[in-house]
């Protein structure tokens, strides 16, 4: 806290410029008008102030705007954004994507801070949904952003926004998140032809149901093992050996290396050993020949 003292004669700042770095903290407090500072915040970002001097400038803005800064000031906060508390940021009304970008740039290369998380939350809530341009921006700065959202939050993502999602943006998503995103992706890419469709939908397939995997198996997609291993176990189990062979194409040989891991392990246990042998991969653990398999869930449905 800087003591209130009168500004020395001739030192009253007429504009925000480099000469202010020669002001002591108390002089900045006494000689820089808060309203002038607010209108010339963009200049602050070109002046090499010390952190202590910036604290004084922030204090002046806090006094001028106790209910929260206007967007005209927020857009030019630069480093001062990192000095804000989440409580400060909750008072803001940020509507411009340019403002969001400018503040994310300041934090670029760092983990998502509480300030950034709060800013994004305020911005998205203000927009009402996670539109394509916002998603584009957020995933460019934070590739893991999408997977940090709850399934409930993801439900507000319109299918049109899915076009902005890159495969790496989904790396840390869990099955519950992919369950929400997959139907949106299916809708977004529905007008694409087979091979193009598969390229786009591939990253989302961790949320695909059995019937969609069966449909893909009819399209010569040659799914790689990495994608197959991310599929929902419950979606893979009903697939026949022939369907998995068609789904994987030349990659089917990779099943051998994954036979002890889910979902391959669980799928093998559900297949007839005779059928597995047709692959010629030496997969073991299928249902022995001559055994009768009762599907109890089907029996319950009939009774």
């Amino acid at each position: 806290e800087v003591e209130k003292t009168a500004c020395p004669s001739g030192k009253k700042a007429r504009e925000i410029d480099e000469s202010l770095i020669f002001y002591k903290k108390w002089e900045l407090e006494a000689c820089v008008d808060a309203a002038l500072l607010a209108t010339q915040m963009d200049r602050v970002n070109a002046i090499p102030f010390t952190y202590e001097q910036l604290d004084v400038l922030k204090h002046k803005l806090d006094e001028l705007y106790p209910q929260g800064y206007p967007e005209s000031v927020i857009q030019h906060l630069g480093y001062l954004f990192l000095k804000m508390s989440p409580e400060d940021i909750r008072k803001w009304n940020v509507t411009s994507l340019e403002t969001l970008k400018a503040l994310l740039e300041v934090n670029k290369g760092h983990e998502m801070s509480p300030q950034v998380a709060t800013l994004i939350d305020r911005f998205v809530k203000g927009r009402g949904q996670l539109d394509k341009d916002t998603l584009d921006t957020l995933t460019a700065f934070y590739p893991g952003y999408l997977c940090s959202l709850s399934p409930e939050e993801l439900s507000s993502v319109p299918p049109s926004s899915i076009w902005a999602v890159r495969p790496q943006d989904l790396d840390t998503c869990d099955p519950r998140q992919l369950d929400v995103l997959y139907p949106k992706a299916r809708l977004a890419f529905q007008n694409m032809n087979g091979s193009e469709y598969f390229v786009k939908i591939q990253s989302f397939l961790g949320g695909a149901p059995t019937e969609d995997l069966k449909a893909l198996s009819q399209q010569n997609v040659s799914m790689d093992l990495a994608t197959f291993m991310k599929l929902r176990t419950d979606a893979v189990l009903p697939l026949t050996v022939a369907e998995v062979q068609k789904l994987l194409g030349p990659h089917v040989e990779g099943l051998k290396a994954e036979e002890r891991h889910r979902p391959v392990r669980d799928w093998i246990l559900r297949q007839r050993q005779d059928d597995l042998d047709t692959l010629g991969l030496g997969l073991q653990g299928g249902i022995p020949n001559g055994y009768l398999v009762l599907d109890l869930s089907m029996q319950e449905a009939l009774s």
């Epitope: 090499p48 952190y51 480093y79 954004f81 740039e105 300041v106 670029k108």
Partner: nanobody, 115 residues
Framework: LQLVESGGGLVQPGGSLRLSCAAS????????IGWFRQAPGKEREGVSS????????NYADSVKGRFTVSRDNAKHTVYLQMNSLKPEDTAVYYC??????????MGQGTSVTVS
């Protein structure tokens, strides 16, 4: 983001020193740089500044005509040439920088003693 100062030391009154400010883990080229100093028991004060291009420089009244700030963007370094040093120039000298989007960096300081 971290800046690193060097070149401080002990010098006699009337002597000269050249301080350097370099960046650690990033490049200084698009950063405007300010030099500051803090004498024992006193508040940190501004000494000089230089724009990112090097085209604009400023000095505190107390060092005008004695100190010169410059930069060599090929070496990613900013210099403070200090001539005609006086005992009252004794302090820890720091550089601070501001780059694109208001990103900031500051150093830990280098000590200058004029005695």
């Amino acid at each position: 983001l971290q800046l690193v100062e060097s070149g401080g030391g002990l010098v006699q009154p009337g002597g000269s020193l050249r301080l350097s400010c370099a960046a650690s883990g990033f490049t200084l080229d698009n950063y405007a740089i300010g030099w500051f100093r803090q004498a024992p028991g006193k508040e940190r004060e501004g000494v000089s500044s230089i724009s990112s291009s090097g085209g604009s420089t400023n000095y505190a009244d107390s060092v005008k005509g004695r100190f010169t700030v410059s930069r060599d963007n090929a070496k990613h370094t900013v210099y403070l040439q200090m001539n005609s040093l006086k005992p009252e120039d004794t302090a820890v000298y720091y550089c601070a920088g501001v780059g694109n989007y208001g990103r900031r960096a500051m150093g830990q300081g280098t000590s200058v003693t004029v005695s």
